[in-house]
Interface confidence: low
């Protein structure tokens, strides 16, 4: 399967998305931290990055919870996480991020 | 359902490399990590390390020099190697998912002992 | 590396008393904490995760609680399937596990 990521908001800063299965989807925030946002960002080109809360709720899938990185993968995919769709949350708990050079 | 098992030789001569095979069912290694972690007799936990999802791999950076984990996803296995192994490597082998940074699910685990 | 401090090293309980078991870590951990019961001869079992979510299929009369550097594991009431070693262990910054704390039966 295909899996790309994009932010919602702006270029730079807003709502963590990553597209899987032919859908857009949200990550849930559980243990969503700096080191996360520093991978999710990297994906995009960026250099560094943070986390962010309150980020406004998205819609559909929330495809990823428990996401756990070290801040030293190249991608989320190499993070442990939970399975694809596997999550206990809700969309008040969208995940952010805003990303820099 | 998930199931972890630890398989390899019972006893290893000093000096010598200890290789391990994790096998698991019930679930893809290409979408968890799975982690080693050992036990001396009558001691503690200590992790070992680890090969992510993504086929990444982490070390115990006291363990790093002699320690390689590596995988083979159509066996659905998990190898360990270390080498010049001394007594101290005593113990018992667990292999264990792990999820969200907890290790959710756990093999029963293989006693190694290191002795001539 | 992140220190664990577990207390006590050994304790003693009767069935239906509430048990307290603590870890500290030598600097903040942002809550990965979790909690690990190992009984005699089997591997260790999730309890609790992320300091204070219970693992299915745990009975609620383990619960955890903490944040920062302090964090404690609750029996409410000690049953004797309890009898068993309890590790805390920290996956912030690195993978770290207690020494344990022994449960026993007065």
């Known amino acids: 399967n295909s899996v790309s990521v994009r932010i919602v908001g702006s270029s730079n800063r807003g709502r963590a998305e990553v597209y899987y299965s032919g859908t857009w989807g949200t990550i849930c925030d559980d243990e969503w931290d700096n080191s996360d946002a520093i991978v999710f960002c990297r994906m995009l080109g960026y250099s560094k990055g943070r986390a962010l809360s309150s980020v406004g709720a998205g819609t559909g899938q929330i495809w990823l919870d428990n996401v756990q990185c070290r801040g030293t993968e190249s991608t989320l995919w190499s993070c442990t996480k939970n399975s694809w769709g596997h999550h206990d949350c809700s969309h008040e708990e969208d995940a952010g991020v805003e990303c820099s050079v | 359902q998930v199931q972890l098992k630890e398989s390899g030789p019972g006893l290893v001569q000093p000096s010598q490399t200890l290789s391990l095979t994790c096998t698991v069912s019930?679930?893809?290694?290409?979408?968890?990590?799975l982690s080693w972690v050992r036990q001396p007799p009558g001691k503690g936990l200590e992790w070992i390390g680890a090969?992510?999802?993504?086929?990444?791999?982490d070390y115990n950076s006291a363990l790093k020099s002699r320690l390689s984990i590596s995988r083979d996803t159509s066996k659905s296995q998990v190898l360990l190697k270390m080498n010049s192994l001394q007594t101290e490597d005593t113990a018992i082998y667990f292999c264990?998912?792990?999820?969200?940074?907890?290790?959710?699910?756990w093999g029963q685990g293989v006693m190694v002992t290191v002795s001539s | 590396d992140i220190q664990m401090t577990q207390s006590p090293p050994v304790l003693s309980a009767s069935v239906g008393d509430r048990v307290t078991l603590s870890c500290k870590t030598s600097?903040?951990?942002?809550?990965?904490l979790d909690w690990y019961q190992q009984k005699h001869g089997e591997a260790p079992k999730l309890l609790i995760y992320?300091?204070?979510n219970l693992q299915t299929g745990i009975p609620s009369r383990f619960s955890g609680s903490g944040s920062g550097t302090d964090f404690t594991l609750t029996i409410s009431t000690l049953q004797p399937e309890d009898v068993a070693t309890y590790y805390c262990?920290?996956?912030?910054?690195?993978?770290?596990f207690g020494a344990g704390t022994k449960l026993e039966l007065k």
């Open positions: 264990t998912r792990e999820l969200g940074g907890s290790f959710d699910y």
């Open positions: 019930g679930f893809s290694l290409t979408s968890y990590t």
């Open positions: 090969i992510w999802g993504g086929d990444n791999t």
């Open positions: 600097q903040n951990i942002n809550k990965k």
């Open positions: 992320y300091t204070n």
């Open positions: 262990y920290q996956y912030d910054s690195g993978f770290t």
